[in-house]
C-alpha cells in the first residue's frame, strides 16, 4: 500500500487557446484531469487502473502551482494504491477548461481539453521527485512525481507490512525495508524475547523483561551458576541442584561427619604425630620425652629409674646423672666393688656369689626388684597396657586407663564400634578388627549407607520437552529444570506464540 | 508536416556493427517513447527496441538483447540504434516509430535497409 | 511472451466486398491492440487502436472490435486502395508482438 504523488508545477499556455486552436474566453480557467494506469508497451485509452485524480481550476492560462501540501491542500496530488507497487507505470494528463463551476466530465464539451499528455513511466519507492516537463506547440506542462509507501507499509514495492509496538506481542520498530529493529534489550523474530542480564546463565536462568536473571529451581546467585546443595548440607558443595559433595575430611549424607579429626581439631600436642583412625578417633606418637594421650605429658628421663643399685637420679638439660651408693660405679651404678661378704642385699635377697667371690647377684623376695633387691616392684615396666593405655601403680597392684574405644583389664577388648549406631537408614553393623562395616539397606550404599541409590525420582524421565530432572533427597521428589519456552511442573505446557497477531 | 527519417543502414558483414540513426521534425519528439521495428525481406514486422520519452526506460527483443542499444538525444530530437555482432538474421528494414495510441499519435519513418552477409 | 495468431493469412475479395480477419491473443491484452495497413515498399499505416477505436483520416468502412483475447477488423464494403496486408499488433506487453499478417488480394 502506498501513495503515488503528483506535484504540478507550472502550466504555460500563452496563448491561451484549447487543443483545437481555439481561444478560450475570457482565458483558459485551468484545471487538470490525471489517470495512473499499468505499464503498456503502447500507451493506450483504458481504464485508469492504478486511480484517478482531478483538480479544481488552479489559474488562468499561464501559472505556477504553489506546493499545498502544509496546508492540506491538493498538491501534490494523491493517488493511492493498495497493491504492490510494481516500478513502472503509465501516466495522463489532461488540461481542461472550465467555462463554468461544474468540472464533471459530462458537464463539459469535448472541445474544452486544452492539452493532453501521456508517458510511461519507472519510479522505485522512495526515489527523490523525478522531475519531467512536456511540450507542445501551444502548451507546456512542469511536473514533478514521486512514490512513497502509506504508514506502516515498508520495502521497495511498498507491500511489507509492519506495525511499531512496545507490548506483549513484540518490542520494536521498523526498519526501512520493512524488517522489524528490536528496541534495546529484546531480541528474537518478533523481539518478543527479553535479553537478561549479561552473563545470566542460558541455561539455569531466564528473564520475563531485559536486564533481569531469575534463576530456574535448584540454582542461585546474581547469574543463576550457582547450585543450590541439598538442604542441611553442612560441609559439602555442589555441581548439579541438591547435591551435597563432601569436602575432603567431611563424610556422611550432609557432610557433618567429621573424618579428618587431626586437621580441623589438631589435637596431638608438644610436636607429636596424628592420624585419623576413624570417625571422631585418632591417635598421636608422640616425640621423645612426651606422653599422654595427647602427647601433653613432659616425660622425666628419670622417670623410668634407670640408676641401679639405689642410684638417684638426678635430671639434666642433656639427660639424667646417677649419684651410685658406696660399692657401685658405673652410668646406671650398674658396676659394684661389694661382695656377699658385704650383705649387699637387701629386703632379704639372698646372695650368690659370681666370677670366684669377685662379683655377686641377689635374688630378690617378690615384690622387689633391682640389683639388690632395693626397688619395689613397679608393675608398670612390663607395659602391660595394650592399644596406648596409659599404665598406673596403686600401691601392690595396678591399673589401666584405657583409651577411647578400648576397655578390659588390660585395655585388650575393642570397645564395639557397633554401639554408637553408626549405619545410616537401618544399615546393620559388624565389628571388625579394625574398624566396622555396614550392610546396607536397598536403596542405600557407602560406608555407613548414607548415600541414596536406587530410590530415584528422575528414573521414569518424569520431565517433558528434554527438561533437565533433578532428584530431592530430602523428600524423594523431582525437580524439573524447564528449556526456553516451556513451564510448567513438568516442562509439560509451550509458552506458546498466539497463533495470529493483530497487527 | 511530421517526419522521421532513418539513415546509417547498408552491407556489413557478420559479426559487424552499424548505428541507426532517426532524425524527428514535426512534432515534440521528447514528448514520446519511441520503438524499432524491422521487416525482413518478404516476412511480416517485428519488433525490436523501445526507448521511454525521457530515456529511463529500455527494452529489447530476446535476440538482440546484449547485442543492440537505443538511445536518444532530445536535445537534437534523434534516436539512435547501435547495432554490435550483427548477423544474417538481422537482414532487415528497420524503421524508427514514435507510437502513443493515448494520444493517437502513430508517426512510422520509411525504413533503413540493413544487409548482414559475407 | 504474448503470441500473436492472426487469420487467415491470405483473402481474395472483390471491391464492394466485406471482409474481416481476427487476431487471437495468448492471454488477456485489456483491448489493447492495434490494427495496421501495409503497401508494398511503405510505412505500415494505424487504422484502429484499442481495438476499436478508429484512427484520424482513416474512413468509416475500416472497424474494430473485440475484448480480452479475441479482435477483429471489419472492411465493410471493400474499396481498390483496400488491397494490401493487414497486421494486428500488441501493445499491453513487451515483447510487442505482431499477427503474421493478412495479405488482401483483389479475386
Known amino acids: 500500500s502506498g501513495v503515488f504523488q503528483l506535484q504540478l508545477q507550472e502550466f504555460i499556455n500563452e496563448r491561451g487557446v484549447l487543443a483545437s486552436g481555439r481561444p478560450c474566453e475570457p482565458g483558459c480557467r485551468t484545471f487538470f484531469r490525471v489517470c495512473l494506469k499499468h505499464f503498456q508497451a503502447v500507451v493506450s485509452p483504458g481504464p485508469c487502473t492504478f486511480g484517478t485524480v482531478s483538480t479544481p481550476v488552479l489559474g488562468t492560462n499561464s501559472f505556477a502551482v504553489r506546493d499545498d501540501s502544509s496546508g492540506g491542500g491538493r498538491n501534490p496530488l494523491q493517488l493511492p494504491f493498495n497493491f504492490t507497487w510494481p516500478g513502472t507505470f503509465s501516466l495522463i494528463i489532461e488540461a481542461w477548461h472550465a467555462p463554468g463551476d461544474d468540472l464533471r466530465p459530462e458537464a463539459l464539451p469535448p472541445d474544452a481539453l486544452i492539452s493532453k499528455i501521456a508517458i510511461q513511466g519507472s519510479l522505485a519507492v522512495g526515489q527523490n521527485w523525478l522531475l519531467d516537463e512536456q511540450t507542445s506547440t501551444l502548451t507546456r506542462l512542469r511536473y514533478s512525481y514521486r512514490v512513497i509507501c502509506s504508514d506502516n507499509y515498508y520495502g521497495d514495492n511498498c507491500s511489507r507490512l509492519c506495525k511499531k509496538r512496545n507490548d506483549h506481542f513484540g518490542h520494536y520498530v521498523c526498519q526501512p525495508d520493512g524488517n522489524l529493529s528490536c528496541l534495546p534489550g529484546w531480541t528474537g523474530e518478533y523481539c518478543q524475547q527479553p535479553i537478561c542480564l549479561s552473563g545470566c546463565h542460558e541455561q539455569n536462568g531466564y528473564c520475563s523483561k531485559p536486564a533481569e536473571c531469575l534463576c530456574r529451581p535448584g540454582w542461585q546467585g546474581r547469574l543463576c551458576n550457582e547450585c543450590i546443595p541439598h538442604n542441611g548440607c553442612r560441609h559439602g558443595t555442589c555441581s548439579t541442584p541438591w547435591q551435597c559433595t563432601c569436602d575432603e575430611g567431611w563424610g556422611g549424607l550432609f557432610c557433618d561427619q567429621d573424618l579428618n579429626y587431626c586437621t580441623h581439631h589438631s589435637p596431638c600436642k608438644n610436636g607429636a604425630t596424628c592420624s585419623n583412625s576413624g570417625q571422631r578417633s585418632y591417635t598421636c606418637t608422640c616425640r621423645p620425652g612426651y606422653t599422654g594421650v595427647d602427647c601433653e605429658l613432659e616425660l622425666s628421663e628419670c622417670d623410668s629409674n634407670p640408676c641401679r643399685n639405689g642410684g638417684s637420679c638426678k635430671d639434666q638439660e642433656d639427660g639424667y646423672h646417677c649419684l651410685c651408693p658406696p660399692g657401685y660405679y658405673g652410668l646406671h651404678c650398674e658396676h659394684s666393688t661389694l661382695s656377699c661378704a658385704d650383705s649387699p642385699c637387701f629386703n632379704g635377697g639372698s646372695c650368690r656369689e659370681r666370677n670366684q667371690g669377685a662379683n655377686y647377684a641377689c635374688e630378690c623376695p617378690p615384690n622387689f626388684t633391682g640389683s639388690n633387691c632395693e626397688k619395689k616392684v613397679d608393675r608398670c615396666t612390663s607395659n602391660p597396657c595394650a592399644n596406648g593405655g596409659q599404665c598406673l601403680n596403686r600401691g601392690p597392684s595396678r591399673m589401666c586407663r584405657c583409651r577411647p574405644g578400648f576397655t578390659g583389664t588390660y585395655c585388650e577388648l575393642h570397645v564395639s564400634d557397633c554401639a554408637r549406631n553408626p549405619c545410616a537408614h537401618g544399615g546393620t553393623c559388624h565389628d571388625l578388627e579394625n574398624g566396622l562395616m555396614c550392610t546396607c539397606p536397598a536403596g542405600f550404599s557407602g560406608r555407613r549407607c548414607e548415600v541414596r541409590t536406587s530410590i530415584d525420582a528422575c528414573a521414569s524421565s518424569p520431565c517433558f520437552n528434554r527438561a533437565t530432572c533433578y532428584t530431592d533427597l530430602s523428600t524423594d521428589t523431582f525437580v524439573c529444570n524447564c528449556p526456553y519456552g516451556f513451564v510448567g511442573s513438568r516442562c509439560e505446557f509451550p509458552v506458546g506464540l498466539p497463533p495470529s497477531f493483530p497487527w | 508536416e511530421v517526419q522521421l527519417v532513418e539513415s546509417g543502414g547498408g552491407l556489413v558483414q557478420p559479426g559487424g556493427s552499424l548505428r541507426l540513426s532517426c532524425a524527428a521534425s514535426?512534432?515534440?519528439?521528447?514528448?514520446?517513447?519511441m520503438y524499432w521495428i524491422r521487416q525482413a525481406p518478404g516476412k511480416g514486422l517485428e519488433w525490436v527496441a523501445f526507448?521511454?520519452?525521457?530515456?529511463?526506460?529500455?527494452y529489447y527483443r530476446d535476440s538482440v538483447k546484449g547485442r543492440f542499444t537505443i538511445s536518444r538525444d532530445n536535445s537534437k530530437s534523434t534516436l539512435y540504434l547501435q547495432m554490435n555482432s550483427l548477423r544474417a538474421e538481422d537482414t532487415a528494414v528497420y524503421h524508427c516509430?514514435?507510437?502513443?495510441?493515448?494520444?493517437?499519435?502513430?508517426?512510422w519513418g520509411q525504413g533503413t535497409m540493413v544487409t548482414v552477409s559475407s | 511472451d504474448i503470441q500473436m495468431t492472426q487469420s487467415p493469412s491470405s483473402l481474395s475479395a472483390s471491391v464492394g466486398d466485406r471482409v474481416t480477419i481476427t487476431c487471437r491473443a495468448s492471454?488477456?491484452?485489456?483491448?489493447?491492440l492495434a490494427w495496421y495497413q501495409q503497401k508494398p515498399g511503405k510505412a505500415p499505416k494505424l487504422l484502429i487502436y484499442?481495438?476499436?477505436r478508429l484512427q484520424d483520416g482513416v474512413p468509416s468502412r475500416f472497424s474494430g472490435s473485440g475484448s480480452g483475447t479475441d479482435y477483429t477488423l471489419t472492411i465493410s464494403s471493400l474499396q481498390p486502395e483496400d488491397f494490401a496486408t493487414y497486421y494486428c499488433?500488441?501493445?499491453?506487453?513487451?515483447?510487442?508482438?505482431f499477427g503474421q499478417g493478412t495479405k488482401l488480394e483483389i479475386k
Open positions: 492471454e488477456d491484452i485489456y483491448s489493447n
Open positions: 526507448i521511454s520519452h525521457g530515456g529511463g526506460i529500455t
Open positions: 484499442a481495438a476499436n
Open positions: 514535426g512534432f515534440t519528439f521528447s514528448n514520446y517513447g
Open positions: 499488433l500488441q501493445g499491453s506487453k513487451f515483447p510487442l508482438t
Open positions: 516509430a514514435a507510437l502513443n495510441w493515448e494520444l493517437g499519435i502513430d508517426y
